[in-house]
């Protein structure tokens, strides 16, 4: 029955870019200006998205597809389909409730978006800090402190351990 009904439904013949107009005997009418239908058989057209303020038009609305927005310079998109525009901050900052603020000591952000993240704790991996962290950059971990003992080279691997009782060749 469902199949039969859909075959008999005159609206199913209405292509994308039109709607099935109940007020006009279910004739396929073109979508009015600033609206679209992306699939056939629709009984209404959807209102086009408008890109205003910090939103810029990336793609104009057409009768068959919605407009697409991106953000004005100095802002970046968030969310599916750029549903939000958020202000960029400088590297070494994060966006807080009061605007862009410098990363606290011990944290960094190497991008213009996102939050400040803690420096890597080199000692957790048994390593030492080779290059100190900044607001913009994470620390660089180097060899473990044991590898840096006097006479040890961080480049040449340690000699293989000899079994006890074996004299050198």
């Amino acid at each position: 029955f469902e199949r039969t009904r859909s075959l008999q439904d005159p609206c199913s013949n209405c292509p994308a870019g039109t709607f099935c107009d109940n007020n006009r005997n279910q004739i396929c009418s073109p979508c009015p200006p600033n609206s679209f239908s992306s699939a056939g058989g629709q009984r209404t057209c959807d209102i086009c998205r408008q890109c205003k303020g910090v939103f810029r038009t990336r793609k104009e609305c057409s009768s068959t597809s919605n407009a697409e927005c991106d953000c004005t310079p100095g802002f970046h998109c968030l969310g599916a389909g750029c549903s939000m525009c958020e202000q960029d901050c400088k590297q070494g900052q994060e966006l807080t409730k009061k605007g862009c603020k410098d990363c606290c000591f011990g944290t960094f952000n190497d991008q213009k978006r996102g939050i400040c993240r803690p420096w890597t704790n080199c000692s957790l991996d048994g390593k030492s800090v080779l290059v100190n962290g900044t607001k913009e950059r994470d620390v660089v971990c180097g060899p473990s402190p044991a590898d840096l003992s006097p006479g040890a080279s961080s480049v040449t691997p340690p000699a293989p351990a000899r079994e006890p009782g074996h004299s050198p060749q």
Partner: nanobody
Framework: AVQLVESGGGLVQRGGSLKLSCVGS????????MSWARQVPGKGFEWVAY???????YYADSVKGRFTISRDNAKDTVYLHMNSLKFEDMAVYYC????????????????WGQGTQVTVSS
């Protein structure tokens, strides 16, 4: 339909004052946080000030102490009182709803006015 209409822009001497108004219609104004943003030709947008529905406010550092945002829910209007105007305040000023309530962020369902030009002369 939702509408925001700004007024009050114009030419003002450096150090002078202006009061911008933004009248909202087509939505429950008193329930919405509101914002003022500005765009300098050749530069991007920057947020200027925000006001929550309860009247609490936020200001950009560049305008703190000189600009005051306020609202009159009975008149569906948000204001921006601008004092000690500087050349760098010259811009088109926009009023917008502020659904995200995160400083520096607007979403696709926010509504924007058409903008009002503020020109600062010597």
């Amino acid at each position: 339909a939702v509408q925001l209409v700004e007024s009050g822009g114009g030419l003002v001497q450096r150090g002078g004052s202006l009061k911008l108004s933004c009248v909202g219609s087509g939505f429950d104004f008193s329930d919405h946080a509101m914002s003022w943003a500005r765009q300098v030709p050749g530069k991007g947008f920057e947020w200027v000030a925000y006001i929550y529905s309860d009247g609490s406010t936020y200001y950009a550092d560049s305008v703190k102490g000189r600009f005051t945002i306020s609202r009159d829910n009975a008149k569906d209007t948000v204001y921006l009182h601008m004092n000690s105007l500087k050349f760098e305040d010259m811009a088109v000023y926009y009023c917008a709803t502020w659904r995200s309530q995160q400083v520096g962020r607007w979403d696709e369902y926010d509504h924007w006015g058409q903008g009002t030009q503020v020109t600062v002369s010597s």
